[in-house]
Structure formats: C-alpha cells, structure tokens
C-alpha cells in the first residue's frame, strides 16, 4: 500500500499527495488558538484504471460498470490527527486531538 | 456521520450509495468458489461544497484552493469485509475475510 508524493510544480498526472500548509489566521478562523498553521497536504491527480486502487471493490465496480459510476477518484487513503487548542461554542478553551486533519497517503477509490 | 442511500431509479444528484450486485461468474472469475455473487454497492453523485464531507480537512483544502485540487468526490467512507472461499495462486483453497468489499456508506472527501 503506497502512494506517490509530488511537489506543487510537478507535472505528474497520476493521483499524488501534494504539500499544503493551512493557515487558520488567513482564513479568519480566530477560534483556533494553536496551531495557527499546519501542514495538511492534499490529493490531486487522475485515477486511471488500476493505478493506486486502494480496494478490490474499486476494480469490481469498474468491471461491472453500473450506470452513473464515475470511476475512482484521487482521495486520502491514510490520514492522521493533530492536537489543537481552540474555543468551543461555549467560549471554553479545549485541548484535543482532531482526527483526519493531515493527509499521509493518497490513492484511488 | 451519515450517508444517503438511493436506488437505481433515483433522481438524487448528490453523493449517494447505490445498490450493485457483483457476479463473479459473469466476470469469468472462476477462482472464486463462494460466494458466486454478492451485494457490493457503489458510490455516485455530486459533491457540492460541504455536503456529506467526511473530514474537516476536505473543507480546509476547498478554502485554501491549491492549484490542481479538483474538489471533493463521492467515495466510500465506510466499508465492510465479506468471507470468501477461493483458490490462491498455488491452487490451494483459502477461506478468508476479504476487507473493503462492501460499501456501507458514501461521502465526499
């Protein structure tokens, strides 16, 4: 189970993980105390038949070719959490692990 | 965490789970002993901003809008295994649980 890593200038056409730094301050998300920025990454690229397919199911749907199935797309296949300090809706400061905030691997599903 | 369920006649445009029965015999996959057919389901539909987004990360990437990011797509967000009886490459009969063979829920990621 592997995935490609690319940089933002790469001409790679296949499904790949690209670097992306999310800046909460730039978004105006002032309820987030820390971190102000973090490396989130994102997935982009084409999912040609079979390349980087995460599940056998993806292959089976392609073979069955039901109406409306758009083929696999490039999406996170492994994600990890980050620890965050933030205000909740009641203006209380919360420290917690927020799941699925960082893309570790991309694939076709 | 929920997902829409549709049938094959539905006019729903959003990301939805549709029924699909995979027929191994019809595919000519004669190394599979049992089951000969199973309900696999598949995901199809549009991922308008925010609808059925599985991760906060999806929202953040949309907001950052990096070059080449194609927006979220409709993909399995929960899958389950099935038990299968099949011949492996050495012609041995194997009984095992094959992961991610059934789509239980669809979402946008």
């Amino acid at each position: 189970d592997f995935g490609l890593d690319c940089d933002e200038h790469s001409t790679e056409s296949r499904c790949c993980r690209y670097p992306l730094t999310v800046d909460f301050e730039a978004f105006g998300w002032d309820w987030i105390i820390a971190p102000k920025r973090y490396k989130a990454n994102y997935c982009s690229g084409e999912c040609e038949f079979v390349f980087l397919q995460k599940y056998p199911h993806t292959h089976l749907v392609h073979q069955a070719n039901p109406r409306g199935s758009a083929g696999p797309c490039c999406t996170p296949t492994k994600m990890s959490p980050i620890n965050m300090l933030y205000f909740n809706g009641k203006e209380q400061i919360i420290y917690g692990k927020i799941p699925a905030m960082v893309v570790d691997r991309c694939g076709c599903s | 965490d929920f997902g829409l369920d549709c049938d094959e006649h539905s006019t729903e445009s959003r990301c939805c789970r549709y029924p699909l029965t995979v027929d191994f015999e019809a595919f000519g996959w004669d190394w599979i002993i049992a089951p000969k057919r199973y309900k696999a389901n598949y995901c199809s539909g549009e991922c308008e901003f925010v609808f059925l987004q599985k991760y906060p990360h999806t929202h953040l990437v949309h907001q950052a809008n990096p070059r080449g990011s194609a927006g979220p797509c409709c993909t399995p967000t929960k899958m389950s295994p099935i038990n299968m009886l099949y011949f492996n490459g050495k012609e041995q009969i194997i009984y095992g649980k094959i992961p991610a063979m059934v789509v239980d829920r669809c979402g946008c990621s």
Epitope: S10, T11, E12, E46 | -
Partner: antibody
Framework: EVQLLESGGGLVQPGESLRLSCAAS????????MNWVRQAPGKGLEWVST????????YYADSVKGRFTISRDNSKNTLYLQMNSLRAEDTAVYFC???????????????WGQGTLVTVSS | EIVMTQSPATLSVSPGERATLSCRAS??????LAWNKQKPGQAPRLLIY???TRATGVPARFSASGSGTDFALTINSLQSEDFAVYYC?????????FGGGTKVEIK
Amino acid sequence: EVQLLESGGGLVQPGESLRLSCAASGFTFSSYAMNWVRQAPGKGLEWVSTISGSGGYIYYADSVKGRFTISRDNSKNTLYLQMNSLRAEDTAVYFCAKDSRYNWNYGNFDYWGQGTLVTVSS
Amino acid sequence: EIVMTQSPATLSVSPGERATLSCRASQNVSSNLAWNKQKPGQAPRLLIYATSTRATGVPARFSASGSGTDFALTINSLQSEDFAVYYCQQYNNWPLTFGGGTKVEIK
C-alpha cells in the same frame, strides 16, 4: 492518422476577445491531455495552457492566467481557448498540441497542429 | 520557473557532417526532456522524448543523451531536411518551458 486543425484566429484590438478551436481526429480524444502553445513572430515557443483528458485538471502560464480559459468538448473532439482582455504581446501563432502519454507526466507533445495566427493591434 | 538555455544559438554545418546541440536546465528536470524540430512556416515536430527516446518515424541519425540539467542532441550525417530550428523542452515542472532554440544552417 492524428490530425489537429486550429481555427478562430484573426485580427483584434487590445482588450477584445477571441475564441480558438482545435478539431482533433485519429485518436481517442478523451484519453489524452491537450495543450496550447504559442509562438510570437520570429520568436521561440511558449507554453500557454494544458487540460487533462477528462477536463478535471487545468494549468496555465502566469502570463495568461485570469485572462485565458482552456476547455474541451470530448463529445465533439474539440479543444478550445477563450482569450479575453487581449494584449499586443499575445500576438502569436497558436498551436494546439496533443499530449503523448509516453509517461505519466503532462506536457510531452507528440503531435502539433499547423497553428492559427492571432494578431492584437490597434 | 525552470529556464532552458540552448547553445549555440546558430550552428553552421555542412551536409553529411555531425551537429551537436546543447541544452541546459536551471534545475533538475530528471529525464523529462524533449527535443522538437521546426522548419519555417511549419508546426514543430517531436523528435526525442524522455531525454533519449526517438519518436515514431524519427531516423536513427538523431540521438540524444543527458540527465538532470545537461542534455545534448546529436545529428549524424546531416541531410538537407535537417536544416531547421531545434527546441529543447522540459516537462518535469509547471510551467512547461522551452529553450530559445538552435538554428542549424547550411555552411
């Protein structure tokens, strides 16, 4: 035989718009990324834009970003370049070029059209 | 942006002789380099891709080599139809960039 035929060029004034077309034949159009490359009179080649086979991925040169829009109609085997806010420096022969798919990188052109001349002048 | 620099700008060669054209990238482009040939009033034509692979229908007298940042195109025993402008082009990074061209003219 692969054929690419550009059309839509002509003389326009600065600030005006023009839409170029490239009619493709001889290959499965939807399976290949397509490109526009231009050449100013007496000058070298300059890449303008690339669009993936599905149309889902699009890339532009900084010099045209925000003014030019690449698109494709796979049902008509046609590539387009909508050029707005044209400037004198956009004067060039515009070639459409097919991506080769010799490897997984965009931008390797194996067939080129003959080009269409765009002149921007007052 | 990766800058592609070709040298010489003009190369004067007699028919039947060998011509060697140089192309240098300002940063590593791996093997994602192509060579195109263009005659006056015509469209470019792909000669070489992936640094050294000849495109379909390209004669064996054309060969190319290099890696990373330094590349070369060699034309053995120049024929009359080989007198043209040659462009190198990298397709490793956006934006795609071409060299300024080398004009191969009859000596």
